[in-house]
C-alpha cells in the first residue's frame, strides 16, 4: 500500500480467482483513543471499532472510503483505491491502446518547436467517476522540472456505438534551450483514477522526436502573366523556433486533383515558394518537417487551385 | 559566446554543402546499423545517450545563434579556448566568436574520427564480418574537417592490446552513431544560418 | 540506371536565348524530379531550377527567375531549358540531374540527385 495523495491510498493487488488479497491497516488520525468506529462508504454498518482497523483487502468491494467516527463526529478518511496486476502485467482497462506508432501506446505528445513546451493527449470510452493527474521531468534518477497542467477533455467522439472522449494536458520543462542537445528524455507519468480503480501510464521522449510543425501559414497564389502558371508561396509557422536559419523547415509540395483516383504530384523544396501548373478543380498543398531531424510532417494547408 | 549576424561573404558559405553531406551520411550508417543490428539493443529507445565531447568541446554554446543569447537556459557557464583560424572563414570581419564555433566544430569531428577508426579496426576483425564503417561517412568527416582547416595535433588512433568484445563494439558503435547524428544535426543548423547571415 | 545526354549549349550574345534539352534513358523518367545545375570555372555547382515526376511544380533560383523556364516531356523523356535575355554572368556548364522520387530528394540541394549529365557548356558574350 502506498499513498498517491493525503487521504488517498492505493493497494496493488495480484488480480487472479481466490488470491488471499493484501491485508491493509488502518490508523484513524486523531488523539482520541477510545470510542471509535469505522464505517465504509455511505454504509452506517460499523466495520470495527479503536483506532487502527485492519481489513483484507481482496476485491472492489473491500476498497472506498473508510472513516473513523466518535460519538456522530467525522474523525478522517481514508480512500482506498486497487492497482490490479494480472499475470505480472499492471492493467491498463481505463485508456485506450492508440497503437500508433507501436502497439501499447496509451500517452501520444507532440511539440509544435523545441521551446520545450509539449502537449500529450489520450483516449478513453469512460464518461464518468474520472480523474487523472500528470507529473513530467526531463530523466528519472536525477529529474530536472518540468511543469504540467491540469488534464482536460479536449474532444468528444463517436465510435461506432461507443462514443470516444479525448484529454489533454499541456507541459512546459522549466528550463529549456532550443538549441541544445538532449540527451537525458523526457518522462511523463499519468495516474488515472476511474471509480475505486488506480491506473499510471508512464511515457518516456525526446523532443526532437515528437516535433510536428504546425502547417505552413499564409498560403497564397498569384497568377502568372501569360500563363497557365501561378507562384504559389507560403510562411513558416508562427509558433516554429527562430532563428528560421538555424531552425530550418523542408516543405512538400503537392497538387492534386478533384478526383482521388488522378495522380499526386509532388516536390520537397527548402525554399517558400514554387511555380504550379494549376488544373481547373486541383488543390495545392503544403506541408513542412524539420530539415535537419526528420520528425513528424505537419498537417497539410490547403487551397483551391480556382 | 555566440554567433554574429554579420558573418561570411556572400555566396556559398565552403562549409554547408559539407555538413548536409556529413548529416546525410550518418543518417544512411545510422539506418543501416538499426538494420544490421536489429537484435541488438540499437534504437534510440533501447541505448544509452552518451556525448564523447561532453566537457571537451562546448559546440552548441559556442555556435549559439545571437537570438538565443537572451535565453538564460542557452548560456552555460564552460568556457574553452580554441585555436582560431580556418578558411571556411570567408571573411576578415569574421569574429573570434564564430571562430570559437568552427574550432568547436573541428575538434568534435576529430574525435569522432578517432573513435570511428578505432572502431572500424576492431570490426574488421569480427569473423561474423556483421558491419563495418561506411567509408563515405568517414571521408564525408575528412572534407569537412578539410573545409574547417584548423591546424591542430593529431590525436593516434587509439589501439588496444586486449581481444575485443565484438558485441560490446557494435552497441558502442549504435551509442557513438546517435550522438554522432545528434551533432551533426546541430552542425548543419549552425552552417545554415552562418550561410544565410 | 538512368543516362542523361545534355546538348543545346554553344556561344550567344547577351540578350539572346537558348534552349538546353536533356534526354533520358530508361522507361522509369517519369518517377524522377528533374533538375538543372550550373557550375562557372572556379565556383560550386548551383541550383537553377527543378521540375516535379508530373511537371506541374517547378521553381527556379534567383537569379534566373523571370528569364528561365525548366519542362519536360515524360512521353519523350526529356526535360528542357529554355533560356532567355542570357547575361555574361550565366555563362557556365549547365548539367541535368535526376534524383528518384522514392527517396524523398530536396529538390534543390545538388547533393540529393542520383544521376548526372556530362554538362554542355553555355557561354555569354557581352
Known amino acids: 500500500i502506498w499513498e498517491l495523495k493525503k487521504d488517498v491510498y492505493v493497494v496493488e493487488l495480484d488480480w487472479y480467482p481466490d488470491a488471499p488479497g493484501e491485508m491493509v491497516v488502518l490508523t484513524c488520525d486523531t488523539p482520541e483513543e477510545d470510542g471509535i468506529t469505522w464505517t465504509l462508504d455511505q454504509s452506517s454498518e460499523v466495520l470495527g471499532s479503536g483506532k487502527t482497523l485492519t481489513i483484507q483487502v481482496k476485491e472492489f468491494g473491500d476498497a472506498g472510503q473508510y472513516t473513523c467516527h466518535k460519538g456522530g463526529e467525522v474523525l478522517s478518511h481514508s480512500l482506498l483505491l486497487l492497482h490490479k496486476k494480472e499475470d505480472g502485467i499492471w492493467s491498463t482497462d481505463i485508456l485506450k491502446d492508440q497503437k500508433e506508432p507501436k502497439n501499447k501506446t496509451f500517452l501520444r505528445c507532440e511539440a509544435k518547436n523545441y521551446s520545450g513546451r509539449f502537449t500529450c493527449w489520450w483516449l478513453t470510452t469512460i464518461s464518468t467517476d474520472l480523474t487523472f493527474s500528470v507529473k513530467s521531468s526531463r530523466g528519472s534518477s536525477d529529474p530536472q522540472g518540468v511543469t504540467c497542467g491540469a488534464a482536460t477533455l479536449s474532444a468528444e467522439r463517436v465510435r461506432g456505438d461507443n462514443k470516444e472522449y479525448e484529454y489533454s494536458v499541456e507541459c512546459q520543462e522549466d528550463s529549456a534551450c532550443p538549441a541544445a542537445e538532449e540527451s537525458l528524455p523526457i518522462e511523463v507519468m499519468v495516474d488515472a483514477v476511474h471509480k475505486l480503480k488506480y491506473e499510471n501510464y508512464t511515457s518516456s521522449f525526446f523532443i526532437r522526436d515528437i516535433i510536428k510543425p504546425d502547417p505552413p501559414k499564409n498560403l497564397q497564389l498569384k497568377p502568372l502573366k501569360n500563363s497557365r502558371q501561378v507562384e504559389v508561396s507560403w510562411e513558416y509557422p508562427d509558433t516554429w523556433s527562430t532563428p528560421h536559419s538555424y531552425f530550418s523547415l523542408t516543405f512538400c509540395v503537392q497538387v492534386q486533383g478533384k478526383s482521388k483516383r488522378e495522380k499526386k504530384d509532388r516536390v520537397f523544396t527548402d525554399k517558400t515558394s514554387a511555380t504550379v501548373i494549376c488544373r481547373k478543380n486541383a488543390s495545392i498543398s503544403v506541408r513542412a518537417q524539420d530539415r535537419y531531424y526528420s520528425s513528424s510532417w505537419s498537417e497539410w494547408a490547403s487551397v483551391p487551385c480556382s | 559566446r555566440n554567433l554574429p549576424v554579420a558573418t561570411p561573404d556572400p555566396g556559398m558559405f565552403p562549409c554547408l554543402h559539407h555538413s548536409q553531406n556529413l548529416l546525410r551520411a550518418v543518417s544512411n550508417m545510422l539506418q543501416k546499423a538499426r538494420q544490421t543490428l536489429e537484435f541488438y539493443p540499437c534504437t534510440s529507445e533501447e541505448i544509452d545517450h552518451e556525448d564523447i565531447t561532453k566537457d571537451k568541446t562546448s559546440t552548441v554554446e559556442a555556435c549559439l545563434p545571437l537570438e538565443l543569447t537572451k535565453n538564460e537556459s542557452c548560456l552555460n557557464s564552460r568556457e574553452t579556448s580554441f585555436i582560431t583560424n580556418g578558411s571556411c572563414l570567408a571573411s576578415r570581419k569574421t569574429s573570434f566568436m564564430m571562430a570559437l564555433c568552427l574550432s568547436s566544430i573541428y575538434e568534435d569531428l576529430k574525435m569522432y574520427q578517432v573513435e570511428f577508426k578505432t572502431m572500424n579496426a576492431k570490426l574488421l576483425m569480427d569473423p561474423k564480418r556483421q558491419i563495418f564503417l561506411d567509408q563515405n561517412m568517414l571521408a564525408v568527416i575528412d572534407e569537412l574537417m578539410q573545409a574547417l582547416n584548423f591546424n591542430s595535433e593529431t590525436v593516434p588512433q587509439k589501439s588496444s592490446l586486449e581481444e575485443p568484445d565484438f558485441y560490446k563494439t557494435k552497441i558502442k558503435l549504435c551509442i557513438l552513431l546517435h550522438a554522432f547524428r545528434i551533432r551533426a544535426v546541430t552542425i548543419d543548423r549552425v552552417m545554415s544560418y552562418l550561410n544565410a547571415s | 540506371e538512368v543516362q542523361l545526354v545534355e546538348s543545346g549549349g554553344g556561344l550567344v550574345q547577351a540578350g539572346d536565348s537558348l534552349r538546353l534539352s536533356c534526354a533520358a534513358s530508361?522507361?522509369?523518367?517519369?518517377?524522377?524530379?528533374m533538375g538543372w545545375f550550373r557550375q562557372a570555372p572556379g565556383k560550386e555547382r548551383e541550383f537553377v531550377a527543378y521540375i516535379s515526376t508530373g511537371g506541374l511544380i517547378s521553381d527556379h533560383a534567383d537569379s534566373v527567375k523571370g528569364r528561365f523556364t525548366i519542362s519536360r516531356d515524360n512521353a519523350k523523356n526529356t526535360v528542357y531549358l529554355q533560356m532567355n535575355s542570357l547575361r555574361p554572368e550565366d555563362t557556365a556548364v549547365y548539367y541535368c540531374?535526376?534524383?528518384?522520387?522514392?527517396?524523398?530528394?530536396?529538390?534543390?540541394?545538388?547533393?540529393?540527385?542520383?544521376?548526372w549529365g556530362q554538362g554542355t557548356q553555355v557561354t555569354v558574350s557581352s
Open positions: 530508361g522507361r522509369t523518367f517519369s518517377t524522377y524530379v
Open positions: 540531374a535526376a534524383a528518384s522520387r522514392t527517396r524523398r530528394p530536396i529538390a534543390t540541394i545538388k547533393d540529393e540527385y542520383d544521376y
